[in-house]
């Protein structure tokens, strides 16, 4: 096994955006320790929420990696409202190979939430020569960047879409685009396609904007 | 200084897409060596193009990093056509802390180039209530992902734009969006805005699509 005189490293990951926005899902903060040696394989975790120690984390069995070190993961389930209200989550990792415990802290991006504006854009006239066309959903002006986007038609999910990662805009908010690809015939028949967005700053955390060939829709 | 028994690491970076597509620019392959120790600071580079050693690389003075290690960079200028034709560039790094030299190889993404389709999309009617509006350029169907996008108006560059990274589409090609933000008044006055795209599969490696309020443009 390689000697790792630098000792283990610790990485702390936030919950998935969708998990924090939906009550029936389970948001988790994940503390990952890598480069744990065979000589000192024992890792101890302590978790704190706003500085107060909590004891409901679950530590998974350590996993051996290809480079003959271990990876150890501890997962803390968080309360939706605690995360959205900006509470701080600290993971404190102790291991004999470390001169002192490593502490990592994470919380929701600070700053005033801003509501996304959602705009749907029909295909370019030039694309109408193709068999398939692109329907576009521009989601802009939102903060923080945690967001979820999907498409529907006639109340049923549309699956052939692709969404860009949120990008930082010049005003400090975020934007993204989502592209739904549909057969031109479906578009020309006047079917209605809807772009759905979930974000914490939206009323009811949800909005939907529709798009169809017939004008005014 | 920390002991780094793993020794240095080597990273090889491709040229910027725009540099490979414009004859007036200088495409460079960059070889970066990190975690070079004070004990063994000397780094030797050898460069190969399609297996043949070349001697025109420039090695920069080593730079001390915050963690008391050195970072050393060597830059090889490449011929535009060599890169676009898929030649392989190898950087071979020797250092006393390494049991054997480290070799890294890079070349243009393999596969048949595919020409981007470029579509400009005007602002949504709903956005016209705002002081600024979003002009969208959808670039899709291209391969490989190396591409450059910019905006201009009346032959002058427009700077308030933001371009998403290329995203892999369902057919194996790439797409991206670029969003230009302009004052609504400029849009309503009928100014013409153009999205310029550079990609190796385009005729003359360049195309431009325009967008304005007046119909048919």
């Amino acid at each position: 096994a390689p000697e790792l005189l630098g000792g283990p490293s610790v990485f702390l990951f936030p919950p998935k955006p969708k998990d924090t926005l939906m009550i029936s899902r389970t948001p988790e903060v994940t503390c990952v320790v890598v480069d744990v040696s065979h000589e000192d394989p024992e890792v101890q975790f302590k978790w704190y929420v706003d500085g107060v120690e909590v004891h409901n984390a679950k530590t998974k069995p350590r996993e051996e990696q290809y480079n003959s070190t271990f990876r150890v993961v501890s997962v803390l389930t968080v309360l939706h409202q605690d995360w959205l209200n900006g509470k701080e989550y600290k993971c404190k990792v102790s291991n004999k190979a470390l001169p002192a415990p490593i502490e990592k802290t994470i919380s929701k991006t600070k700053g005033q939430p801003r509501e996304p504006q959602v705009y749907t854009l029909p295909p370019s006239r030039e694309e109408m020569t193709k068999n398939q066309v692109s329907l576009t959903c521009l989601v802009k002006g939102f903060y923080p960047s945690d967001i979820a986007v999907e498409w529907e038609s006639s109340g049923q999910p549309e699956n052939n879409y692709n969404t860009t990662p949120p990008m930082l805009d010049s005003d400090g908010s975020f934007f993204l685009y989502s592209k739904l690809t549909v057969d031109k015939s479906r578009w020309q028949q006047g079917n209605i396609f809807s772009c759905s967005v979930m974000h914490e700053a939206l009323h009811n955390r949800f909005t939907q904007k529709s798009l169809s060939l017939s004008p005014g829709k | 200084a920390p002991e780094l028994l793993g020794g240095p690491s080597v990273f090889l970076f491709p040229p910027k897409p725009k540099d490979t597509l414009m004859i007036s620019r200088t495409p460079e392959v960059t070889c970066v060596v990190v975690d070079v120790s004070h004990e063994d600071p000397e780094v030797q580079f050898k460069w190969y193009v399609d297996g043949v050693e070349v001697h025109n690389a420039k090695t920069k003075p080593r730079e001390e990093q915050y963690n008391s290690t050195f970072r050393v960079v060597s830059v090889l200028t490449v011929l535009h056509q060599d890169w676009l034709n898929g030649k392989e560039y190898k950087c071979k790094v020797s250092n006393k802390a390494l049991p054997a030299p480290i070799e890294k190889t890079i070349s243009k993404t393999k596969g048949q180039p595919r020409e981007p389709q470029v579509y400009t999309l005007p602002p949504s009617r709903e956005e016209m209530t705002k002081n600024q509006v979003s002009l969208t350029c959808l670039v899709k169907g291209f391969y490989p992902s190396d591409i450059a996008v910019e905006w201009e108006s009346s032959g002058q560059p427009e700077n308030n734009y933001n371009t998403t990274p290329p995203m892999l589409d369902s057919d194996g090609s790439f797409f991206l969006y670029s969003k230009l933000t302009v004052d609504k008044s400029r849009w309503q006055q009928g100014n013409i805005f153009s999205c310029s795209v550079m990609h190796e599969a385009l005729h003359n490696r360049f195309t431009q699509k325009s967008l304005s309020l007046s119909p048919g443009k």
Epitope: K18, M22, E150, P157, S196, M198, N204, T207, Q208 | -
Partner: nanobody, 121 residues
Framework: QVQLQESGGGLVQAGDSLRISCRAS????????MGWFRQAPGKEREFVGR??????????YYVDSVKGRFTISRDSAKNTVYLQMNSLKLEDTAVYLC????????????WGQGTQVTVSS
């Protein structure tokens, strides 16, 4: 354990009204798209309509054949979704199934067993 349990079906006269319910356990109806489907004997399962996630009805969708007659609503406190059916027609006879879909999911994730609605003349 996620469960959707329909109830309230029965035999009614054409032109009458009926409200059927779908009680959820193991999930929260406000978090999901909650939909109603129906399956008449010897026919394919047919989508009826759905409400979107969040405590609102702004984006509720109905198929044309039930628009104006059927209404989907939700009671978050009871974690229950309802289908109010008015002006029932003979062709509304079917087993009515409740379904839930997570945001971003490509298909309906959770299904109930169904409740029989029979409309007679």
């Amino acid at each position: 354990q996620v469960q959707l349990q329909e109830s309230g079906g029965g035999l009614v006269q054409a032109g009458d009204s009926l409200r059927i319910s779908c009680r959820a356990s193991g999930l929260t109806v406000n978090d999901l798209y909650m939909g109603w489907f129906r399956q008449a004997p010897g026919k394919e399962r047919e989508f009826v309509g759905r409400v979107t996630p969040g405590d609102n009805t702004d984006y509720t969708y109905y198929v044309d054949s039930v628009k104006g007659r059927f209404t989907i609503s939700r009671d978050s406190a009871k974690n229950t979704v309802y289908l109010q059916m008015n002006s029932l027609k003979l062709e509304d006879t079917a087993v009515y199934l409740c379904a839930g879909r997570r945001f971003g999911s490509s298909e309906w994730d959770y299904w109930g067993q169904g409740t029989q609605v029979t409309v007679s003349s």
